[in-house]
């Protein structure tokens, strides 16, 4: 038998993926474990094999269909179980009644690009990926810019309280290399959290014109 503290956390990407992490103190690394999804009003069941991500945690993705297919709605409840093999039997290690639209974490924004860059400002756009049409415009974004000599953790957060897939960065230094990231969060859901940060977009401001005040 496995003893210790167990934590089972899952998020729905709003389309066709439920990502789960199970943590268990004292669990065996070589034990075979599965996450089993049993929707209350669908004809499908889905499993994924948990793979170790650290000494005491495992993760897997329940892929419910094609990436942009809408597999669950706000009224769905999915019973999620962690089952681990013990000899010839399977033991339920964790269970939760999962409400997908109360536990949202979207995919990171994609296709970041510089629309226009000047000496002191830069206009950047991006796209959201695999986000449900149910949200309409009810999304918010956070962005951050990495300046030379600083870390991402030191970068101030810029908040966009609406579905705005662009930003104009101001008061930049001429002829300077920067990096930019953005993340997204639906307004819906009690346990909804921010998406991962996007891949960083590197850009350089234009040099100041010679003989001009900057």
């Amino acid at each position: 038998a496995v003893n210790g503290t167990s934590q089972f956390t899952c998020f729905y990407n709003s389309r066709a993926n439920i990502s789960c992490v199970w943590s268990q103190d004292g669990a065996l690394q070589d034990t075979s474990c599965q996450v089993h999804a049993w929707p209350d009003r669908r004809r499908w069941n889905q499993t994924c094999e948990l793979l170790p991500v650290s000494q005491a945690s495992w993760a897997c993705n329940l892929i419910l269909g094609a990436p942009d297919s809408q597999k669950l709605t706000t009224v769905d409840i999915v019973t999620l179980r962690v089952l681990c093999r013990e000899g010839v039997r399977w033991r339920v290690m964790a269970i939760q009644d999962f409400k997908p639209f109360e536990n949202l974490r979207l995919m990171a924004p994609i296709s970041l690009q510089v629309v226009h860059v000047e000496t002191h400002r830069c206009n950047i756009s991006w796209e959201i990926s695999q986000a449900s049409h149910y949200f309409e415009r009810h999304l918010e974004f956070e962005a951050r810019t990495l300046s030379p000599g600083h870390t991402w953790e030191e970068a101030p957060l810029l908040t966009l309280k609406q579905k705005q897939e662009w930003i104009c960065l101001e008061t930049l230094t001429p002829d300077t290399q920067y990096e930019f990231q953005v993340r997204v969060k639906p307004l819906q859901g009690e346990f909804t959290t921010w998406s991962p940060w996007s891949q960083p977009l590197a850009f350089r401001t234009k040099p100041a014109a010679l003989g001009k005040d900057t």
Epitope: H36, L51, I63
Partner: nanobody
Framework: EVQLVESGGGLVQAGGSLRLSCTVS????????MAWFRQAPGKEREFVAT????????EYVDSVKGRFTVSRDNAKNTVYLQMNNLKPEDTAVYYC????????????????WGQGTQVTVSS
């Protein structure tokens, strides 16, 4: 709807090897736990081997352990059955099966099936 197509069967002498392939189309391959079954003339279809969605865990019927290896290539949407040291009693039609639910993959009525490929082992 998911479709499965097997290939690689044939006639081989006892002690020889064959590699079966099953290519999946029509859905996201990594959703599926995959399995191989076989049906010998006049017998019921029986489970041979299974591989989980990640490919990490495999299971086999006792009679093929140590001789058969099941694997999958998620980039190629294909599952394989490498069969070594074949015996006449391995003669059967080999079927590929898919199920999104690992716990139902051994259930004959729950799976999506390929059309099968004939394996004949002569003594």
């Amino acid at each position: 709807e998911v479709q499965l197509v097997e290939s690689g069967g044939g006639l081989v002498q006892a002690g020889g090897s064959l590699r079966l392939s099953c290519t999946v189309s029509g859905d996201v391959f990594v959703r599926y736990t995959m399995a191989w079954f076989r049906q010998a003339p006049g017998k019921e279809r029986e489970f041979v081997a299974t591989v989980t969605d990640s490919g990490r865990t495999t299971e086999y019927v006792d009679s093929v352990k140590g001789r058969f290896t099941v694997s999958r290539d998620n980039a190629k949407n294909t599952v394989y059955l490498q069969m070594n040291n074949l015996k006449p009693e391995d003669t059967a039609v080999y079927y590929c099966a898919a199920n999104t639910d690992y716990f139902r993959i051994r259930s004959l009525d729950a799976n999506t099936w390929g059309q099968g490929t004939q394996v004949t082992v002569s003594s």
